[in-house]
């Protein structure tokens, strides 16, 4: 290389990361195998769970404002879960990104898109509940499924906007041991006259902005909304929280627990630019907390089911019946189910966002299992515990 051929400029912390070499330690190899297995399982679970939630909530349930929020949360989690197999592959090939720069940018962007979308949607859910209790008349007149979808659309647009810097500054960097990193390179675009200053300011700006916009502000909105609702309900003499409140509380708690550590380490990483002593801690901790953040997308569908009353009891009692009904051949069912269709309301308040989804009263085959999870297969689609929790607009 000629003396004047400037190498790809990297921030000090990134260059030091590129110098870290892989160990051939046996115990570390076992940890790697376990990580691949765990992430592989999480990928599969996340895709299946969120796919089921999307299908059930979008196609098998009466559309309400609440189901609209859940639908969009599940969509965000499905996106994240869909990117998890590629992260698993990255781990499997020895922590090396072999899928190219463009896919590195896209993959990382999905992670951040999910981060922002989750935070924004949980804020919207909390504000929605707050409005229902604090401004019931206004909510009665303006709380429509169409309005909820419009709000979600705006929130998705904001999430995309906030993800742009992460797409722009994501890059593939070759490590000195031959592996490839898919990581921030804040000097990638217009590094400015002073690289050290650019590294410090941009890394800090990214860490602080994502902490505020995707974590602190949403949690502040959620806490404020919860406080406002609690105060109002205390005046009305209501004690027991409704089903939907329990569901939201569980999802918010999971969000805080899964994303909190990630933001802590992200802020530490920004500090590590000026304080190299923090770097080893960041390098060791970030992979774990990033995985924990990913797992939030896998945990949410489980929470939707577990926070609904009677679910486990119903599971134990009806498992045999369910298996029997699933294993019934299509020909034994007769054609009755396909000829009867549940009448859907034409109002904006209950219109399905997925026009292609028809709603048979008695789904067939595997769909019968999903139907049971949300209520009795033979009964009205609104009678299942998850359905009741999601359809509850006043609790």
């Amino acid at each position: 290389m000629s003396a004047n051929a400037t190498l790809k400029p990297l921030c000090p912390i990134l260059e030091q990361m590129s110098r870290l070499q892989s160990h051939s330690n046996t115990s570390i190899r076992y940890i790697d195998h376990a990580a691949v297995l765990l992430h592989g399982l999480a990928s599969l679970l996340g895709l299946v769970e969120n796919g089921v939630i999307l299908f059930v909530v979008g196609c098998r349930m009466r559309q309400t404002v609440v189901t609209t929020w859940v639908l969009h949360l599940a969509l965000s989690d499905l996106l994240a879960s869909a990117s998890l197999p590629f992260f698993t592959y990255f781990l499997a090939v020895g922590h090396s990104w072999e899928l190219g720069t463009t896919f590195c940018k896209l993959h990382s962007s999905i992670f951040f898109l999910n981060m922002f979308a989750s935070g924004f949607l949980l804020s919207a859910i909390s504000l929605d509940r707050c409005l229902q209790v604090v401004r019931p008349v206004w909510a009665q007149n303006h709380r429509t499924v169409a309005a909820a979808h419009k709000v979600c659309l705006v929130l998705w647009a904001l999430a995309v906007l906030n993800t742009v810097p992460y797409f722009v500054f994501r890059d593939t960097i070759s490590r000195l041991d031959g592996r490839i990193m898919c990581y921030y390179n804040v000097l990638l675009l217009n590094p400015g006259p002073d690289r050290d200053a650019t590294c410090n300011s941009r890394q800090a700006a990214l860490a602080v902005s994502k902490f505020l916009l995707a974590f602190l502000v949403p949690l502040a909105i959620i806490a404020s909304s919860h406080a406002a609702v609690s105060l109002r309900l205390q005046h009305r003499g209501r004690r027991r929280p409704g089903r939907f409140v329990r569901l939201v509380a569980a999802v918010v708690a999971a969000f805080a627990l899964c994303w909190g550590p990630y933001h802590v380490f992200s802020l530490l990483e920004a500090r590590a630019h000026a304080n190299p002593g923090l770097r080893p801690l960041v390098w060791r901790g970030l992979p774990f907390v990033t995985s924990l953040a990913f797992f939030n997308s896998v945990a949410n569908p489980v929470l939707y089911v577990l926070t609904c009353p009677d679910m486990l009891r119903k599971l134990r009692r009806s498992l045999r019946t369910v298996l029997e009904s699933v294993l019934v051949d299509d020909s034994e069912l007769g054609g009755a189910g396909s000829s009867r269709r549940r009448r859907t309301s034409s109002t904006a308040r209950s219109a399905s966002p997925l026009a292609l989804c028809s709603r048979p009263e008695e789904p067939r085959g595997p769909a019968r299992l999903l139907g049971w999870l949300l209520g009795s297969c033979a009964a009205s689609p609104q009678t299942g515990p998850l359905n009741r929790a999601l359809s509850s607009t006043s609790s």
């Epitope: 003396a3 190498l7 921030c11 260059e15 110098r19 000195l176 002073d194 690289r195 050290d196 190299p276």
Partner: antibody, heavy 118, light 107 residues
């Protein structure tokens, strides 16, 4: 060809001041971080100052902090080291060195001798 | 401050010998280590950076290895032009300190 030429060395009394210069050529000076390294006669090497490519970040070891100031003029392709309150132990050959990336001195000047003596 | 301890401080060897110089840091420096060669009256020259990477124009008989706190510079077959003083330097946390040097002399 990369060239770093130091100047400004000489004999100075204890407590005195001196300003060293390093003229750079053969590369885009403003793209590289720079450092000063010294070597006392018959002794080892000691890093004494660092400056980022744009000049916003500087760093020094405790032995010279508060006495030495590193600066640069990218328009003149020149690096400077202002040395105040000089002591006998500051006697050394002072080298300016270019950082390969953020670290690793890939090019060095030939050095300039600073003698602090009464 | 991180202390860098080089050993041996001097060694005598013949042309064609395999020479190994070690450098020990007082704490983990995560491969942020460089090796320099200095001949009398001359400026130091970068030989190895990032503990294992050969600098441009350096013959392949030189190699760097190590991790954590222990690093090694090896010259597989010593040549007449290799007789010089070798210094290690860490670039982990400032101040970036050098080892005291290893003088490789002709036996």
């Amino acid at each position: 060809e990369v060239q770093l030429v130091e100047s400004g060395g000489g004999l100075v009394q204890p407590g005195g001041s001196l300003r060293l210069s390093c003229a750079a050529s053969g590369f885009t000076f403003s793209s590289y971080s720079m450092s000063w390294v010294r070597q006392a006669p018959g002794k080892g090497l000691e890093w004494v100052a660092y400056i980022s490519n744009g000049g916003s970040t500087t760093d020094y070891p405790g032995t010279v902090e508060g006495r030495f100031t590193i600066s640069r003029d990218n328009s003149k392709n020149t690096l400077y080291l202002q040395m105040n309150s000089l002591r006998a132990e500051d006697t050394a050959v002072y080298y300016c060195a270019r950082h390969r990336t953020n670290w690793d001195f890939d090019y060095w000047g030939q050095g300039t001798l600073v003698t602090v003596s009464s | 401050d991180i202390q860098m301890t080089q050993s041996p401080s001097s060694l005598s060897a013949s042309v064609g010998d395999r020479v190994t110089i070690t450098c020990r840091a007082s704490e983990n420096i995560y491969w942020n280590l460089a090796w320099y060669q200095q001949k009398p009256g001359k400026a130091p020259k970068l030989v190895v950076y990032a503990a294992t990477q050969l600098a441009d124009g350096v013959p392949s008989r030189f190699s760097g290895s190590g991790s954590g706190t222990d690093y090694t510079l090896t010259i597989s077959s010593l040549q007449p032009e290799d007789f010089a003083t070798y210094y290690c330097q860490h670039f982990w946390i400032t101040p970036w300190t050098f080892g005291q040097g290893t003088k490789v002399e002709i036996k």
